[in-house]
Interface confidence: low
């Protein structure tokens, strides 16, 4: 675990779990990468979710200097998605199939976030927007968009942890 004072997380564990997250995110919606919803014209789901951006310290130099900035950003994103996957967007109708990987994905997001949460220290978590789809087809569309965004997010996170495991592990 990361601990107060800026010491490192268990990079190798984080790498393994983030790779598992990537696999789960793709298996949860394998067609996401082959479809284009731009004509939908309603991009706020992907705009209002966490993106890892240039100023977040997730580049090799930023990780070397102080990995806590990047890790906090990843932690915020994991909690954000964990809450979305536990919301009525995914629990409401139409019901997910019993063998859907979304449940496992949800648990793994929580697991990785706990690896990053410093013990005895509370990182601010973000308010989750009230996404209120009233129709089943709207829920399906939101699930699609959220999973697409999550795929991009965990792909970057996995690269961060791979770099950390290779270069920053004690």
């Amino acid at each position: 675990r990361a601990v107060p004072g800026g010491s490192s997380p268990a990079w190798t564990q984080c790498q393994q779990l983030s790779q598992k997250l990537c696999t789960l995110a793709w298996s949860a919606h394998p067609l996401v990468g082959h479809m284009d919803l731009r004509e939908e014209g309603d991009e706020e789901t992907t705009n209002d979710v966490p993106h890892i951006q240039c100023g977040d310290g997730c580049d090799p130099q930023g990780l070397r200097d102080n990995s806590q900035f990047c890790l906090q950003r990843i932690h915020q994103g994991l909690i954000f998605y964990e809450k979305l996957l536990g919301s009525d967007i995914f629990t409401g109708e139409p019901s997910l199939l019993p063998d859907s990987p979304v449940g496992q994905l949800h648990a793994s997001l929580l697991g990785l976030s706990q690896l990053l949460q410093p013990e005895g220290h509370h990182w601010e978590t973000q308010q989750i927007p009230s996404l209120s789809p009233s129709q089943p087809w709207q829920r399906l569309l939101l699930r699609f968009k959220i999973l697409r965004s999550l795929q991009a997010f965990v792909a970057v996170a996995a690269r961060v942890f791979a770099h950390g495991a290779a270069t920053l592990s004690p």
Partner: nanobody
Framework: EVQLVESGGGVVQPGGSLRLSCAAS????????MGWFRQAPGKEREFVAR????????YYADSVKGRFTISRDNSKNTVYLQMNSLRPEDTALYYC?????????????????????WGQGTLVKVSS
């Protein structure tokens, strides 16, 4: 440059309702998240609500949750704030503002400095 004009303010009794509108000219609002803020006399400007481009991602200040509803009509280039169960402490000048960033920025939506275009404000007074 976008110009924002608020309307709909007025004097209302406690428990009453008002609907504020924010109309834009100069540029379409449909590509931007929009926020409502308020400033009571002698106090700092505070966040009230924010709505994303398409209108499904919405944030509220805790003090207005369950009473205020933010919405938008992109075809009319207008953002609304429906205010119900008004209280004396809701008395303030209400401003709408445009968020220039399409990206998630953590809690930045709470900060007035995150918004780049502002209206002149409309006054809401809740008094018996």
């Amino acid at each position: 440059e976008v110009q924002l004009v608020e309307s709909g303010g007025g004097v209302v009794q406690p428990g009453g309702s008002l609907r504020l509108s924010c109309a834009a000219s100069g540029r379409t609002l449909s590509s931007y998240a929009m926020g409502w803020f308020r400033q009571a006399p002698g106090k700092e400007r505070e966040f009230v609500a924010r709505i994303s481009q398409g209108g499904t991602a919405i944030y509220y200040a805790d003090s207005v949750k369950g009473r205020f509803t933010i919405s938008r009509d992109n075809s009319k280039n207008t953002v609304y704030l429906q205010m119900n169960s008004l209280r004396p402490e809701d008395t303030a000048l209400y401003y709408c503002a445009k968020d220039p960033s399409p990206y998630y920025r953590g809690s930045a939506y709470l900060l007035s400095g995150s918004y780049d275009s502002w209206g002149q404000g409309t006054l809401v007074k809740v008094s018996s």
